[in-house]
């Protein structure tokens, strides 16, 4: 039975030209995490295999950095980076757990404005 849950950074926003860390955390399971895949909509960005390490897609190598931990850092953000990102945890014996993050990339002034007037 799959008992685990994935916690993510949820809905996040970042400035155009800046960078952002996408983070997921698997809890409430003793399953062995064998691999974590990071996807943007239908594109595979990176794979972190527990033993063989990080593998970054050549299409994203200039703008994606591994880590921290099992997370993924997106750099030099553009408005086109806005959208859904998924962390897919491959585990044994549970199977697959998926977490979702929505990233909105804003023009610099908009991002600053949004941060200044956040609802508590």
């Amino acid at each position: 039975m799959m008992t685990g849950t994935i916690e993510t950074t949820g809905n996040i926003s970042a400035e155009k030209g800046g960078s952002i860390i996408l983070q997921c955390h698997l809890s409430s399971t003793t399953a062995q995490v064998t691999q974590v895949n990071w996807e943007q909509q239908d594109q595979l960005l990176a794979i972190c295999n527990a033993d063989l390490g990080w593998h970054i897609s050549p299409s994203f190598k200039d703008r994606v950095a591994p880590g921290p931990g099992l997370g993924l850092t997106l750099q030099s953000l553009t408005v086109n980076d806005t959208g859904e990102y998924f962390c897919i945890y491959h585990t044994y014996p549970d199977g697959t757990y998926t977490g979702r993050i929505f990233l909105e990339v804003l023009e610099s002034s908009v991002a600053e404005h949004g941060a200044r007037f956040q609802i508590p």
Epitope: N37, E39, D51, L52, G53, W54, H55, P58, S59
Partner: antibody, heavy 120, light 107 residues
Framework: DVQLVESGGGLVQPGGSLKLSCAAS????????MSWVRQTPDRRLELVAT????????YYPDSVKGRFTISRDNARNTLYLQMSSLKSEDTAMYYC?????????????WGQGTTLTVSS | DIVLTQSHKFMSTSLGDRVSITCKAS??????VAWYQQKPGQSPKLLIY???SRHTGVPDRFTGSRSGPDYTLTISSVQAEDLALYYC?????????FGGGTKLEIK
């Protein structure tokens, strides 16, 4: 030049044990995860074990779990595969393999292989 | 486990021909597919990774592509040295698995 040299293969009776070795040179062995891949007489390839760079994490498919143990000695630049409770279906050529660089998804370096025959 | 099916165990071709070797995944593996070439008496050699990236030193007559669950290794003009076994491998999900192989032969 990267070199991987396997040894230790031979003829073993069903139920027996054997330990394979893979001597690595030409790269920083302690920085890379390593794998054992076998090729059965019908030419099928199967990944049988992986280990991370410091030996702290390992993975096995169900076909060998509990019977095979992968380990490494970074001081000696050597990878090992301890095999026990051997079955006729373990008869194969055993290769150690690795990859270099975070872009590479797959194994870009393989040894020449060592043959295991399980037969009475 | 993800199953990769290489439906042709053997493919016959003539030197200079264009040939396509196919591999079908039992479930989505995105672009996490590699192709290997194995000549008699040798260990496998990485040709293509991330479905379409050519490995260092691999001639540009070798091309990898993807269409949904179908992956293709194309050799634009077969040379004598290309006669070998070809395997696909997926790295999308553990355990990483291989196709059954396709042997490229001369007609």
């Amino acid at each position: 030049d990267v070199q991987l040299v396997e040894s230790g293969g031979g003829l073993v009776q069903p139920g027996g044990s054997l330990k394979l070795s893979c001597a690595a040179s030409g790269f920083t062995f302690s920085s890379y995860g390593m794998s054992w891949v076998r090729q059965t007489p019908d030419r099928r390839l199967e990944l049988v074990a992986t280990i991370n760079n410091n030996g702290g994490s390992t993975y096995y498919p169900d076909s060998v779990k509990g019977r095979f143990t992968i380990s490494r000695d970074n001081a000696r630049n050597t990878l090992y595969l301890q095999m026990s409770s051997l079955k006729s279906e373990d008869t194969a050529m055993y290769y150690c393999a690795t990859r270099t660089g975070t872009e590479i998804l797959g194994f870009d370096f393989w040894g020449q292989g060592t043959t295991l025959t399980v037969s009475s | 486990d993800i199953v990769l099916t290489q439906s042709h165990k053997f493919m016959s071709t003539s030197l200079g021909d264009r040939v396509s070797i196919t591999c079908k995944a039992s479930q989505d593996v995105s672009t996490a597919v590699a192709w290997y070439q194995q000549k008699p008496g040798q260990s496998p050699k990485l040709l293509i990774y991330w479905a379409s990236s050519r490995h260092t030193g691999v001639p540009d007559r070798f091309t990898g592509s993807r269409s949904g669950p179908d992956y293709t290794l194309t050799i634009s003009s077969v040379q004598a040295e290309d006669l070998a076994l070809y395997y696909c491998q997926q790295q999308y999900s553990t355990p990483w698995t291989f196709g059954g192989g396709t042997k490229l032969e001369i007609k």
